[in-house]
Interface confidence: low
């Protein structure tokens, strides 16, 4: 073969030209329209897993490939028919027109064409196999897409039901909010009404207060007048008494002028015939200085001088050294009689000390010391106690041996703190010790876990603050 050329004609059909000597043979072959050229950009694995948006694209590609296969098959059949027809015609022509040696050439060309056809068929078979592989792969991908789609559909359904639930909840809440708004409006209206009523009430009260203020002014004036009248009356009474005593003395010279009786303690008051509980004026030993004290003439035989009382928290017991020295409070209520008086009194003769206690549960107890006295101020009113009996604990809640008295401004305790400041009140603090009857007064339900309350450890334990306490003294030989 001098020349064998493959080219394209103007209408795009493939033509095979064979040059043999002076003869050239041209074969026009039918062209496939839908055949993809080898250079077309096609990626076999272009379908992406779990990408439902490319599902339609994959189906379309599959259809295209099926069409290509069908067209290839048709083209092969056409090619075979075409070759057979041409061969018949050419063979007849060759037999008729050509010389004997041309027959050989034609047979060779025919063989050549058949070889080419076989080659083409093999190639197409390969293409078919590739297409089948690609089809299988696409089918698998389609299956994956199908599963992915199912999953997505399920999720969408779930989400839809969730959305429906939320919508229901939302509508329920909206209703609730509307109901609340209505309620709120009603409440606001009632509040406004109440406010108006209160304003009326306030204005009424203001007018009442004004009237009362006027009355108070008048009462104050009247009170001043009454006080003056009372003073004048007292003066008149005193004058009369003086006149009477003078006239009596003149009548009976044997009756000496009666000396005013003074009492050192409530035991003396009791012995003098005053057996009623109350406030009496007592006189310091070896002095004319007086002090008012409450006398208990009923408890345990009477004659008790009350030196301390707590009952309602009405008196502040966080006082100075001087205040504890001279006494403070109200003898008919909460009070401290005074360390100086008690010290002088208890150093004159032997006294007993009774401490009466009440808790918040209605229980009562007492501690009785058979000997009690306080040292002088120079020794910081140190407490001395002996012989404990009673129901408020077998161990003394006042530390033994006795300690010096301490106040917020007189720190004489055995502590590296200031017990009086920490626990409040003046007391015979140790470090700081198991008692403090002058601590903070705590009302009921606030009286537990209080380290600075009214404490008597060996009766009520740690942190319990008592309801009421009374400290009373009486001569041991009463």
């Amino acid at each position: 073969y001098n020349n064998f050329r493959k080219s394209m004609d103007s209408i795009g059909k493939k033509q095979y030209q064979v040059q043999h000597g002076s003869c050239s043979y041209t074969f026009l072959l039918p062209e496939m329209d839908n055949c993809r050229s080898s250079s077309s950009p096609y990626v076999s694995n272009a379908v992406q897993r779990d990408a439902p948006l490319e599902y339609d694209d994959s189906v379309q590609r599959l259809q295209v490939l099926e069409n290509i296969m069908e067209n290839n098959t048709q083209w092969l059949m056409k090619l075979e028919n075409y070759i057979q027809d041409n061969m018949k015609k050419e063979m007849v022509e060759i037999q008729q027109n050509a010389v004997q040696n041309q027959t050989a050439v034609m047979i060779e060309i025919g063989t050549n064409l058949l070889n080419q056809t076989a080659e083409q068929t093999r190639k197409l078979t390969d293409v078919e196999a590739q297409v089948l592989n690609q089809t299988t792969r696409l089918e698998l991908q389609l299956l994956e897409h199908s599963l992915s789609t199912n999953k997505l559909e399920k999720q969408i359904l779930d989400q839809t039901s969730e959305i429906n639930k939320l919508q229901d909840k939302n509508s329920f809440l909206e209703k609730k909010v509307l109901a609340m708004e209505d309620k709120h409006i009603i409440q606001l209206q009632s509040i406004k009404e109440e406010k108006d009523q209160l304003q009326v009430l306030v204005s009424k009260q203001n007018s009442i207060i004004e009237e009362l203020e006027k009355k108070i002014v008048t009462a104050t004036v009247n009170n001043s007048v009454l006080q003056k009248q009372q003073h004048d009356l007292m003066e008149t009474v005193n004058n009369l008494l003086t006149m009477m005593s003078t006239s009596n003395s003149a009548k009976d010279p044997t009756v000496a002028k009666e000396e005013q009786i003074s009492f050192r303690d409530c035991a003396e008051v009791f012995k003098s015939g005053h057996t009623t509980n109350g406030i009496y004026t007592l006189t310091f030993p070896n002095s004319t200085e007086e002090i008012k004290a409450y006398c208990d003439m009923e408890a345990g035989g009477g004659g008790w001088t009350i030196i301390q009382r707590r009952e309602d928290g009405s008196v502040d017991f966080q006082r100075t050294w001087k205040e504890y020295k001279v006494g403070f409070g109200n003898p008919s209520g909460e009070y401290w009689l005074g360390n100086e008086f008690v010290s002088q009194l208890t150093n004159q003769q032997r006294y007993v000390l009774k401490i009466h206690l009440k808790d918040w549960e209605g229980n009562e107890a007492y501690s009785l010391y058979e000997h009690f006295y306080l040292s002088s101020e120079e020794l910081n009113y140190r407490i001395h106690l002996k012989g404990l009996t009673g129901t408020a604990g077998k161990i003394s809640s006042i530390s033994q041996p006795g300690n010096d008295f301490s106040t917020k401004d007189g720190d004489n305790d055995k502590c590296i703190c200031k017990c009086s400041q920490m626990l409040t009140g003046g007391w015979w603090f140790d470090a700081c010790g198991p008692s403090n009857l002058n601590g903070m007064y705590y009302p009921q339900r606030q009286n537990t876990n209080k380290f600075n309350g009214i404490k008597w450890y060996y009766w009520k334990g740690s942190g319990y603050s008592l309801k009421a306490t009374t400290m009373m003294i009486r001569p041991a030989d009463f």
Epitope: Q400, I416, C417, C432
Partner: antibody, heavy 121, light 107 residues
């Protein structure tokens, strides 16, 4: 709750210094006396120093007098022990302790977990 | 300085035993004495204050007695958790002083 936490321990050469700290929480630190107590390895407890609630008074064991200084910062709720001229015999676990307690001031009631001081060359 | 002498320095006992530890002060300290329990690697824990007052939360099998110079700590019925070292402390004056300790071991 009431808590004391010591810090500042470590290994130090003889003659050198160290400062221990004790952080207090859960109680009114400024109202209570504070102590340092130590325990040498395998030995008993030894009281070291005390400082009054307001820092006005300080006492020391004879073994540390002139070398150790106890101090406090009530604004920081912290107790300190400045240890100078350290000796091998100062090797111990150092505890800070407070006089806080139920019927407090009856000796040390609240203790820290301790910090170890080792004096070695 | 007040010296505190504790005895014995160690003792072996069984669970359920009654144990007594004594502490002697070199001078009178009223009732200004506390008893402490210490377990290995732990901080001391106060059992008794004011010689005979039981610290809150401490079992009643522990008790203290004495005044002046002679003091006693008693464990009425020893329990497994009671095996530890016990110290007395005087807080009557500074410097405060501990006893040398009593180690209670299992027999």
């Amino acid at each position: 709750q009431v808590q004391l936490v010591e810090s500042g321990g470590g290994v130090v050469q003889p003659g050198r210094s160290l400062r221990l700290s004790c952080a207090a929480s859960g109680f009114t630190f400024s109202s209570f006396g504070m102590h340092w107590v130590r325990q040498a390895p395998g030995k008993g407890l030894e009281w070291v120093a005390v400082i009054w609630f307001d820092g006005s008074n300080k006492y020391y064991a004879d073994s540390v007098k002139g070398r150790f200084t106890i101090s406090r910062d009530n604004s920081k709720n912290t107790l300190y022990l400045q240890m100078n001229s350290l000796r091998a015999e100062d090797t111990a676990v150092y505890y800070c302790a407070s006089d806080y307690g139920d019927y407090f001031y009856y000796g040390m009631d609240v203790w820290g977990q301790g910090t170890t001081v080792t004096v070695s060359s | 300085d007040i010296q505190m002498t504790q005895s014995p320095s160690s003792l072996s006992a069984s669970v359920g035993d009654r144990v007594t530890i004594t502490c002697r002060a070199s001078q009178g300290i009223r009732n200004d004495l506390g008893w402490y329990q210490q377990k290995p690697g732990k901080a001391p824990k106060r059992l008794i204050y004011a010689a005979s007052s039981l610290q809150s939360g401490v079992p009643s099998r522990f008790s203290g007695s004495g005044s002046g110079t002679e003091f006693t700590l008693t464990i009425s019925s020893l329990q497994p958790e009671d095996f530890a070292t016990y110290y007395c402390l005087q807080y009557n004056s500074y410097p405060r002083t501990f006893g040398q300790g009593t180690k209670v071991e299992i027999k």
